[in-house]
């Protein structure tokens, strides 16, 4: 399974869509910045086997899909772009699921990577709590959009490293 190639291209497309989704001037939102504590160590290529990385990426995309599928998200973003974003994420989930089962059995990878998946889930919990606390304001969504773009960029960079190791 050539995960890095397919997933990296999908990530780039998702990033482009995220970039296009901005609706308000980012500069008015500076004071809403927040430390979501992106679990960078979970995506550390030095510590990770390819199969474990796939599992963590899968969880991140699943959680991103969940976050942007809420009714509050639908109210915040352009519907056409959001639909395209869903399709991109859904395609990536399918690619990753195929890779997960090909690299290692589903049960094995779930046991092997439970802590990593939990770290990603807690990260998205913090994002959700932040949005709730900010009453899903336009600036809160802008900050979250920027954060998701950064986490996607980070995983894209890691995949380049994984590709070199293949």
């Amino acid at each position: 399974c050539d995960l890095p190639q397919t997933h990296s291209l999908g990530n780039r497309r998702a990033l482009i869509l995220l970039a296009q989704m901005g609706r308000i001037s980012h500069f008015s939102c500076l004071k809403d910045r927040y430390d979501f504590g992106f679990p960078q160590e979970v995506f550390d290529g030095n510590q990770f086997q390819k199969a474990q990385a796939i599992s963590a990426f899968h969880e991140m995309i699943q959680q991103t899909f969940n976050l942007f599928s809420t009714k509050d998200s639908s109210a915040a973003w352009d519907e056409t772009l959001l639909d395209k974003f869903y399709i991109e994420l859904f395609q990536q989930l399918n690619d990753l699921e195929a890779c997960v089962t090909q690299e290692v059995g589903v049960e094995e990878i779930a046991l092997m990577n439970e802590d990593s998946i939990l770290a990603v889930r807690k990260y998205f919990q913090r994002i959700t709590l932040y949005l709730m606390g900010k009453k899903y304001s336009p600036c809160a969504w802008e900050v979250v959009r920027a954060e998701i773009m950064r986490s996607f960029s980070f995983s894209t960079n890691l995949q380049k490293g994984l590709r070199r190791k293949d």
Partner: antibody, heavy 121, light 107 residues
Amino acid sequence: EVQLVQSGAEVKKPGESLKISCKGSGYSFTSYWIGWVRQMPGKGLEWMGIIDPSDSDTAYSPSFQGQVTISADKSISTAYLQWSSLKASDTAMYYCARHPGLNWAPDFDYWGQGTLVTVSS
Amino acid sequence: DIQMTQSPSSLSASVGDRVTITCRASQSIDRALNWYQQKPGKAPKLLIYFASSLQSGVPSRFSGSGSGTDFTLTISSLQPEDFATYYCQQSFDFPLTFGQGTKVEIK
């Protein structure tokens, strides 16, 4: 390696126009904002304005609004600072620096080497 | 605009001294404060971000503290290479603003 490389020193006459540049490399240029900072001879740092290269959205300090124009060309990873009519008081060192935007990350973590602009008749 | 006031504007100290520079904001800026070091003829260098986070590659003798309106930069044991000008800068809201600078000189 992240780098911001600025254009060379300029000597101009009052009333002339000028455009200085700041080229980013070693990182995703559109993922960071680029800010401009002025330092007059023997003085402190003054923030002039900032640009988001992804969509060329800008914000200026009230002190510099209408005095300068900030722009960017993301296709060549370059930000610009320009004057349409220079004054002697524009004589200063100008720095560009990258900013993480709305992300919780270090502000102005990388700086250009500076461009010295001298305006004299 | 948020005004940033640094004190002192200059200080003389010896190698090994503990040095403290303060920065006060005209309104609450939470922890959105950065500290920079600048040496003559060089670009500023980020030392501390978000009030207390040490920038990668910066020696641990530098530390920052504070929140709201009052902030401090501390150099626990001054080294020869630390003689420079230090600036605080708020990143809470636009326009971004710097303090006027504190020059640390050799006694």
